[in-house]
């Protein structure tokens, strides 16, 4: 039949950061194409990435409709080319993905320190509230909008002249920490969702140090 030399997709893997979600799979196609379908446990199977020779499919638009739902995808392999014989093909081959719950599993993207401001012996460090592709009322929500108090940030800070790190935590996007007068400090932040069992932490933000352009120093 026409499906004699089609190969089922394998190694179906979800790659997701801040809800930007792509399904990847193997192999690179030879004389075949793929169509992806996605569904919630109770919903319809919706076809996406029709008849593609890519081995990835951006499913962000589907999963952002409800990030707390659990999704399943499947990749169909369709013959396309000079197969060994032509004739009416049976059901196409397909492979299921693992289940994926965006709210619980999307990776937290690397955060960015937006600014820091020193007033005397206090420093206010602000973390950029990154925009996601999740929408509500036609506007894109920030990471904080989506996760609320489930999301915390950990601040690592240290004197430029030493290696001993201190930490602080916040469930907003701002830290207010005590520093020694006359000392320069360096900062790095990490996003954390403590309630998660997987993908709990982001990578650390780039390090920002006092005395560089991002910050503002005011002696009071």
């Amino acid at each position: 039949s026409g499906t004699t030399n089609t190969v089922a997709a394998y190694n179906l893997t979800w790659k997701s950061t801040n809800f930007k979600t792509i399904l990847e799979w193997e192999p690179k196609p030879v004389n075949q194409v793929y169509t992806v379908q996605i569904s919630t446990k109770s919903g319809d199977w919706k076809s996406k990435c029709f008849y593609t020779t890519d081995t990835e499919c951006d499913l962000t638009d589907e999963i952002v409709k409800d990030v707390k739902q659990t999704y399943l995808a499947r990749v169909f392999s369709y013959p396309a080319g000079n197969v060994e014989s032509t004739g009416s093909a049976g059901e196409p081959l397909y492979e299921n993905s693992p289940e994926f719950t965006p709210y619980l599993e999307t990776n937290l993207g690397q955060p960015t320190i937006q600014s820091f401001e020193q007033v005397g012996t206090k420093v206010n460090v602000t973390v950029e509230d990154e925009r996601t592709l999740v929408r509500r009322n036609n506007t894109f929500l920030s990471l904080r909008d989506v996760f609320g108090k489930d999301l915390i940030y950990t601040l690592y800070y240290w004197k430029s002249s030493s290696s001993g790190k201190k930490t602080a935590k916040t469930n907003t996007n701002e830290f207010l920490i005590d520093v020694d007068k006359g000392e320069n400090y360096c900062f790095s932040v990490q996003a954390v969702i403590p309630s998660r069992t997987v993908n709990r932490k982001s990578t650390d933000s780039p390090v920002e140090c006092m005395g560089q352009e991002k910050g503002e120093f005011r002696e009071i």
Epitope: G43, D44, K46, S47, V83
Partner: antibody, heavy 117, light 106 residues
């Protein structure tokens, strides 16, 4: 048995509005994309676009972006193609066709639209 | 948009003849279908995925090609094969059809 039944022939004047329909039966209507194809008299086929009934997502041929609108009514398993202001160049046969892989191939019988003053 | 150019636009042939219809794409295509349409009827899928015959299509039909050049061949033309044939690409949006090839009786 899968069936797509389209509404009857229409004769309209330029500038008038029109909505033609395609009713699906014998399958889960919301699970399949629905295509619309235009065929002008004595001419070839033109893919206009398609709509996914479950959430009304559309993929539209940019050529028809400002000319025609696709919609659905899930409650009665019906897809629609509509115009707000018809032109003579809209005179054609319009087919709906379920998006399927392979030998599965379901088309409506077509709706003839004639636009003439 | 990918343009599909079919040739010839029409041909006259006799029963038993070998007939070849070509479809040339303006850029590379990985998924090509062919449809048959008879006067006053809706189109029917004839060949899908470049070379796979739809259910009920006789084995005298075949499809081949890759990249930008595709072919539908009828090895021995039969009376019921007189119709118009269209290629269609589904590799990139908007999906497009060729202009059609009308196969007429000589």
């Amino acid at each position: 048995e899968v069936q797509l039944v389209q509404s009857g022939a229409e004769v309209k004047k330029p500038g008038e509005s029109l909505k033609i329909s395609c009713k699906g039966s014998g399958y889960s209507f919301t699970s399949y994309w629905m295509n619309w194809v235009k065929q002008m008299p004595g001419k070839g086929l033109e893919w206009m676009g398609m709509i996914y009934p479950a959430d009304s997502e559309t993929r539209l041929n940019q050529k028809f972006k400002d000319k025609a609108t696709l919609s659905v009514d899930k409650s009665i398993s019906t897809a629609y193609l509509q115009w707000s202001s018809l032109k003579a160049s809209d005179t054609a046969m319009y087919y709906c066709a379920r998006e399927d892989y392979g030998s599965s191939d379901y088309w409506g019988q077509g709706t003839t639209v004639t636009v003439s003053s | 948009d990918i343009q599909l150019t079919q040739s010839p636009s029409s041909l006259s042939a006799s029963v038993g003849d070998r007939v070849t219809i070509t479809c040339s794409a303006s850029s590379s295509v990985s998924y090509m279908n062919w449809y048959q349409q008879k006067p006053g009827k809706s189109p029917k899928i004839w060949i899908y995925g470049i070379s796979n015959l739809a259910s009920g299509v006789p084995s005298r039909f075949s499809g081949s090609g890759s990249g930008t050049d595709f072919t539908l061949t009828i090895s021995s033309l039969q009376p019921e094969d007189f119709a118009t044939y269209y290629c269609q690409q589904k590799s990139s949006f908007p999906w497009t059809f060729g202009g059609g090839t009308k196969v007429e009786i000589k």
